[in-house]
Interface confidence: medium
C-alpha cells in the first residue's frame, strides 16, 4: 500500500483551524490478524529522507497521537491529552486519516508527517509516510481562510517507505 497526501501545502491565518489529511492507497490487507498504526509528527526536510526526524506536535509525541485499530475499523483520539492541546487525529473506513489543529499560531508552521504501519500479529510488516507543509500567516497578507495546494500527482503517488 501507499500513502497519498492530497495537499502538499496548507496556508492558514493565525487563529484558524486546519485539518491535515493523508489517504491510504492500494490493496490493504483486512485480515483479522492485521492492524494499522497511524500517527502524526513534525519533522524537517532532511537532505536524505523527509520525515526521518520525529518531533512533537504541540508537545505531543507521535505516541500520544497514534491510532491503532483493525483494518476495517474507524478510529479517533478521544483522550483528553490531545484535546487539551487543540489536537485530534481521526481515521475513517475509506483509508483517510487526519489531524485537526485548532486555533493555529505562528509556532505551528512547519513540515508535518503522517505515518502508517501495517502490523500483523504485533509485528511491523510495512510502513509508509507522507509529508505536507503548514504555513501559518498573520497580518494583512494572511488569507481569511485556509488555502490548500494540491500535491502534484508525482508527489502524492511517489511516497517513500519510512
Amino acid at each position: 500500500f501507499k500513502v497519498a497526501t492530497p495537499y502538499s501545502l496548507y496556508v492558514c491565518p493565525e487563529g484558524q483551524n486546519v485539518t491535515l489529511t493523508c489517504r491510504l492507497l492500494g490493496p490493504v490487507d483486512k485480515g483479522h490478524d492485521v492492524t494499522f498504526y497511524k500517527t502524526w509528527y513534525r519533522s524537517s526536510r532532511g537532505e536524505v529522507q523527509t520525515c526521518s526526524e520525529r518531533r512533537p506536535i504541540r508537545n505531543l509525541t507521535f505516541q500520544d497521537l497514534h491510532l491503532h485499530h483493525g483494518g476495517h475499523q474507524a478510529a479517533n483520539t478521544s483522550h483528553d491529552l490531545a484535546q487539551r492541546h487543540g489536537l485530534e487525529s481521526a481515521s475513517d473506513h475509506h483509508g483517510n486519516f487526519s489531524i485537526t489543529m485548532r486555533n493555529l499560531t505562528l509556532l505551528d508552521s512547519g513540515l508535518y508527517c503522517c505515518l502508517v504501519v501495517e502490523i500483523r500479529h504485533h509485528h511491523s510488516e510495512h510502513r509508509v509516510h507522507g509529508a505536507m507543509e503548514l504555513q501559518v500567516q498573520t497580518g494583512k497578507d494572511a488569507p481569511s481562510n485556509c488555502v490548500v495546494y494540491p500535491s502534484s500527482s508525482q508527489d502524492s503517488e511517489n511516497i517513500t517507505a519510512a
Epitope: T35, R54, Q63, H69, Q73, I119
Partner: antibody
Framework: QVQLVQSGAEVKKPGASVKVSCKAS????????IHWVRQAPGQGLEWMGY????????EYNQKFKDRVTMTRDTSTSTVYMELSSLRSEDTAVYYC????????????????WGQGTLVTVSS | DIVMTQSPLSLPVTPGEPASISCRSS???????????LEWYLQKPGQSPQLLIY???NRFSGVPDRFSGSGSGTDFTLKISRVEAEDVGVYYC?????????FGQGTKLEIK
C-alpha cells in the same frame, strides 16, 4: 515506576468463568499492549494473547480463542482477562505483562509483569 | 505451533563459573520482516518472570552484562559469563515470530 497490579486469587467450579484484572500505572496506558501468560502449578509458561488498550483490539492464542476475552477500561488503566468454561487444567497463575515495541510499533518483548493471580478450578 | 526445546533442563553451576543454555526451535523463527523475535526470561523462585534478552542478543535495561544472547535461525544460546547466587531460577526462551508465540520448557539453574 511501571507497575502492573493484578486482582486477588480466585477459586472457581468447573464450567464457571473467571475475570482477572490488571491495573497499569507509571506509564501512558494507551501506548503499550498488554499480554496474558499463564503458568500451571510446577509447569512452564504459556502465552494466551494480547490487547491493544487504545482501540480494544485483541488477538488470542487459538488454543483459548473460544473461551478467552480480553477487554480494557481506559478510564482506570485496567485490562481484564475473562476465561470461560473453566476446567481443572485451567488451574494456574495468570500473569499480565506489558508489550514493548519500537518506534514503528514492532513488538520486541514483554518488559514488565504483574505479580500473578492464582486461579484454582475445583469441584 | 513452533516447539521451543531447551537444554539442559537442569543446570547446577558453581558461583563464578560460566553457564550456557541452549534453545532450539522446531522451525526458523526469522520473521517475514527480517527480525528474529527470540527472548529470554528468568523466573526467580516465587517471583514473576523478568525480561533478560530480546531480539536474540539485546540486553534489557538493568540486566547485568554477564548475560548475553546469541544465535540465528533455529539455534539460540543464553550465556552467563560468571554465575552469581542471585541468578538462580528457571530460564525460559520464547519466540514471538509466529503465532501462537511459544515458550521453551525452562531450564532450572541452581548453585552447586
Amino acid at each position: 515506576q511501571v507497575q502492573l497490579v493484578q486482582s486477588g486469587a480466585e477459586v472457581k467450579k468447573p464450567g464457571a468463568s473467571v475475570k482477572v484484572s490488571c491495573k497499569a500505572s507509571g506509564y501512558t496506558f494507551t501506548h503499550y499492549t498488554i499480554h496474558w501468560v499463564r503458568q500451571a502449578p510446577g509447569q512452564g509458561l504459556e502465552w494466551m494473547g494480547y490487547i491493544i488498550p487504545s482501540s480494544g483490539y485483541s488477538e488470542y492464542n487459538q488454543k483459548f480463542k473460544d473461551r478467552v476475552t480480553m477487554t480494557r477500561d481506559t478510564s482506570t488503566s485496567t485490562v481484564y482477562m475473562e476465561l470461560s468454561s473453566l476446567r481443572s487444567e485451567d488451574t494456574a497463575v495468570y500473569y499480565c505483562a506489558r508489550g514493548a515495541y519500537d518506534d514503528y510499533y514492532d513488538y520486541y518483548a514483554m518488559d514488565y509483569w504483574g505479580q500473578g493471580t492464582l486461579v484454582t478450578v475445583s469441584s | 505451533d513452533i516447539v521451543m526445546t531447551q537444554s539442559p533442563l537442569s543446570l547446577p553451576v558453581t558461583p563464578g563459573e560460566p553457564a550456557s543454555i541452549s534453545c532450539r526451535s522446531s522451525q526458523t523463527i526469522v520473521h517475514s520482516n527480517g527480525n528474529t523475535y527470540l527472548e529470554w526470561y528468568l523466573q526467580k523462585p516465587g517471583q514473576s518472570p523478568q525480561l533478560l534478552i530480546y531480539k536474540v542478543s539485546n540486553r534489557f535495561s538493568g540486566v547485568p552484562d554477564r548475560f548475553s544472547g546469541s544465535g540465528s535461525g533455529t539455534d539460540f544460546t543464553l550465556k552467563i559469563s560468571r554465575v552469581e547466587a542471585e541468578d538462580v531460577g528457571v530460564y525460559y526462551c520464547f519466540q514471538a515470530s509466529h503465532v501462537p508465540w511459544t515458550f521453551g520448557q525452562g531450564t532450572k539453574l541452581e548453585i552447586k
